[in-house]
């Protein structure tokens, strides 16, 4: 039975040209985290594997930094970065947990952080 929950940074906004940290946290389970995938819609951004470390997709290498923690830092943001991002925790023996973050990249300087929420 999957007992864990994923807490994410929720709906967030940031300014064009700036950077943002995408964070997820898996709690309420003792399952072993073997890998965390970060995806944007259907595109793989990065993987953090327990044994193999970090892999950043070549097309994002220049503006995606691994961490902090199991998070991901997106740099030099463009309006095209607006959209859904997913953290996918592969665990044993529970299976897969997925968290969703919506990022809006704004032209103006009124970018504000949204509220946190939990996905069971």
């Amino acid at each position: 039975m999957m007992t864990g929950t994923i807490e994410t940074t929720g709906n967030i906004s940031a300014e064009k040209g700036g950077s943002i940290i995408l964070q997820c946290h898996l709690s309420s389970t003792t399952a072993q985290v073997t890998q965390v995938n970060w995806e944007q819609q259907d595109q793989l951004l990065a993987i953090c594997n327990a044994d193999l470390g970090w892999h950043i997709s070549p097309s994002f290498k220049d503006r995606v930094a691994p961490g902090p923690g199991l998070g991901l830092t997106l740099q030099s943001l463009t309006v095209n970065d607006t959209g859904e991002y997913f953290c996918i925790y592969h665990t044993y023996p529970d299976g897969t947990y997925t968290g969703r973050i919506f990022l809006e990249v704004l032209e103006s300087s009124v970018a504000e952080h949204g509220a946190r929420f939990q996905i069971p």
Epitope: T30, V36, C48, W54, K61, L70
Partner: antibody, heavy 117, light 107 residues
Framework: QVQLQQSGVELVRPGTSVKISCKAS????????LSWVKQRPGHGLEWIGD????????NYNEKFKGKATLTADTSSSTAYIQLSSLTSEDSAVYFC??????????WGQGTLVTVSE | DIKMTQSPSSTYASLGERVTITCKAS??????LSWFQQKPWKSPKTLIY???RLADGVPSRFSGSGSGQDYSLTISSLESDDTATYYC?????????FGGGTKLEIK
């Protein structure tokens, strides 16, 4: 298996600088963050900063900015820390360490730096 | 910076005894916590990572627990080889910080 082999003991003069190496083997050097940690007797362990050789990202503890410079040579899978303007306060054992959060850290054997006239 | 308050700073315990060491963070560190064992003139050895996960090759008498701000390392039945100094480390956001250490000795 994962190994971090550090350079040997350094005895250096005050005001000079020293460069310590940490040669990694048994894993893909560019895929992991590598931290440097300082240990002085009675002062516990202090995190100096870390480097991600795969993207040449570095982070520093504010306390060590201007004192420590972290670099990495991907061709030889070696990380370096350079300590400048040395004083007796810099006499310590320096460790390199590799971690991914979701797996345990591996540590080098440590390098003793003694600053003395 | 996040401050890690580790206690006790030193303790004596008998062989076979259960020993618990705690670390309190100044804010929620989301389980980004490791425990290390260090013997004199040796490099630290990872015991626990991600708050509760046992590192490879570490005896099962060691266990980690906690979440949020409060974490603990427990040795279920103390052995003579466990004489060492133990440190916690938070590594969720930089700068990473260590607890002050707990020196564990056998009575």
């Amino acid at each position: 298996q994962v190994q971090l082999q550090q350079s040997g003991v350094e005895l250096v003069r005050p005001g000079t600088s020293v460069k310590i190496s940490c040669k990694a083997s048994g894993y893909t050097f560019t895929n992991f963050w590598l931290s440097w940690v300082k240990q002085r007797p009675g002062h516990g362990l202090e995190w100096i900063g870390d480097i991600f050789p795969g993207g040449d990202y570095t982070n520093y503890n504010e306390k060590f900015k201007g004192k420590a410079t972290l670099t990495a040579d991907t061709s030889s899978s070696t990380a370096y820390i350079q300590l400048s303007s040395l004083t007796s306060e810099d006499s310590a054992v320096y460790f390199c360490s590799r971690s991914t959060i979701i797996s345990g850290a591996y540590w080098g054997q440590g390098t003793l730096v003694t600053v003395s006239e | 910076d996040i401050k890690m308050t580790q206690s006790p700073s030193s303790t004596y315990a008998s062989l076979g005894e259960r020993v618990t060491i705690t670390c309190k963070a100044s804010q929620d560190i989301k389980s980004y916590l490791s425990w290390f064992q260090q013997k004199p003139w040796k490099s630290p050895k990872t015991l626990i990572y991600y708050a509760t996960r046992l590192a490879d090759g570490v005896p099962s008498r060691f266990s980690g627990s906690g979440s949020g701000q409060d974490y603990s390392l427990t040795i279920s039945s103390l052995e003579s080889d466990d004489t060492a100094t133990y440190y916690c480390l938070h590594h969720g956001e930089r700068p990473y910080t260590f607890g002050g250490g707990t020196k564990l000795e056998i009575k």
